[in-house]
């Protein structure tokens, strides 16, 4: 496939990545699927600088990111290592809270109103952010 050298329309370029910010809400799995269909992934936060950039664009609104522990360990959707990577949890989080009454604990991470992270029920309809890297081979066939 061809390499993507500029961001699609309505996406924001930052540090060799493209970001798309939703204005509606979806469950985490649906948001994840939306990004995949756009040849992207839910945002993976790898630095304080990227955290500030995303935070600036989403404002004080609960917003899904590409981090979950639905199969046990916390995992970033693009394979970035959680253990050694950037983290920005709110104090006392993640807490896998069961008191919401929706069944099970909390397995999906989101930006809270102050930008720091919380784990929550994956079915909640939050906004989301998609990310794709520039210079990544796209799925489209090259133009002949």
């Amino acid at each position: 496939g061809s390499e993507r050298t500029c961001c699609p329309v309505n996406w924001v370029e930052h540090e060799r990545s493209c970001y798309w910010f939703s204005r509606s809400g979806k469950a985490w799995a649906d948001a994840d699927n939306y990004c995949r269909l756009e040849d992207a992934h839910l945002v993976v936060v790898t630095s304080w600088e990227e955290q500030k950039f995303v935070q600036h664009h989403i404002g004080p609104v609960n917003t899904w990111m590409g981090l979950h522990d639905q199969n046990g360990p916390w995992k970033w959707v693009d394979g970035t290592d959680y253990e050694t990577g950037f983290k920005n949890w709110r104090p006392e989080q993640p807490d896998d809270w069961y008191g919401h009454g929706l069944g099970g604990g909390e397995d999906c991470a989101h930006f809270t109103d102050d930008g720091r992270w919380n784990d929550d029920v994956c079915q909640r309809p939050y906004r989301w952010v998609c990310e794709t890297e520039l210079d990544k081979a796209s799925q489209e066939p090259p133009l002949l």
Partner: antibody, heavy 114, light 107 residues
Framework: EVQLVESGGGLVKPGGSLRLSCAAS????????MIWVRQAPGKGLEWVSS????????YYADSVKGRFTISRDNAKNSLYLQMNSLRAEDTAVYYC???????WGQGTLVTVSS | DIQMTQSPSSLSASVGDRVTITCRAS??????LGWYQQKPGKAPKRLIY???NLQSGVPSRFSGSGSGTEFTLTISSLQPEDFATYYC?????????FGQGTKVEIK
């Protein structure tokens, strides 16, 4: 390597106390709830207690409530189970587990007998 | 508290057989259920999470299905290393509860 290692089991008289420890390594301990599960000799598995990553939420099985206390020290990557007023029916192998039961320790045997 | 009723309590099967184990919850637990394999003297090992998702590293001959109150673990073609005891666990709400176990023995 992600690992849990229990210790502290042994023989104790009815009414006695014991403190089990579970040492975690290879993962960000504070990011995960942890649990204790036990298995009496020749019997099935029984959930005993859970504690959230920063100890905000703690839960106990009715069979141990008021006698057992779960705690953790994230600075030491350690989980604990303080067991008081032990009874014969508490005799079991005690396992610690984490990552929603993906990782388990090898178990430590607690025997309550006079 | 939610009761988990597992059946059968034991079964005899041969290598290559298709094996099915059932777990019934006393109330709706959505899909918040796991399946575990335990061999003598060893800690349990999670095979399935969220009723139907295969834990990474677990052979694809294991599968889970169900939602609400009825759940099934299927081993499509039993292998020698699969002879063990299997447990279901509901983690939908506290207290978490295990089924009583199903021992799979060699016929």
């Amino acid at each position: 390597e992600v690992q849990l290692v229990e210790s502290g089991g042994g023989l104790v008289k009815p009414g006695g106390s014991l403190r089990l420890s579970c040492a975690a390594s290879g993962f960000t301990f504070s990011s995960y709830s942890m649990i204790w599960v036990r298995q009496a000799p020749g019997k099935g598995l029984e959930w005993v207690s859970s504690i959230s990553g920063t100890s905000s939420y703690i839960y106990y099985a009715d069979s141990v409530k008021g006698r057992f206390t779960i705690s953790r020290d994230n600075a030491k990557n350690s989980l604990y189970l303080q067991m008081n007023s032990l009874r014969a029916e508490d005799t079991a192998v005690y396992y610690c587990a984490g990552m929603t039961t993906v990782i388990w320790g090898q178990g430590t045997l607690v025997t309550v007998s006079s | 508290d939610i009761q988990m009723t597992q059946s059968p309590s034991s079964l005899s099967a041969s290598v290559g057989d298709r094996v099915t184990i059932t777990c019934r919850a006393s109330q709706d637990i959505r899909n918040i259920l796991g399946w575990y394999q335990q061999k003598p003297g060893k800690a349990p090992k999670r095979l399935i999470y969220a009723a139907s998702n295969l834990q990474s590293g677990v052979p694809s001959r294991f599968s889970g299905s169900g939602s609400g109150t009825e759940f099934t673990l299927t081993i499509s073609s039993l292998q020698p290393e699969d002879f063990a005891t299997y447990y279901c666990l509901q983690y939908n709400s506290y207290p978490w509860t295990f089924g009583q176990g199903t021992k799979v023995e060699i016929k």
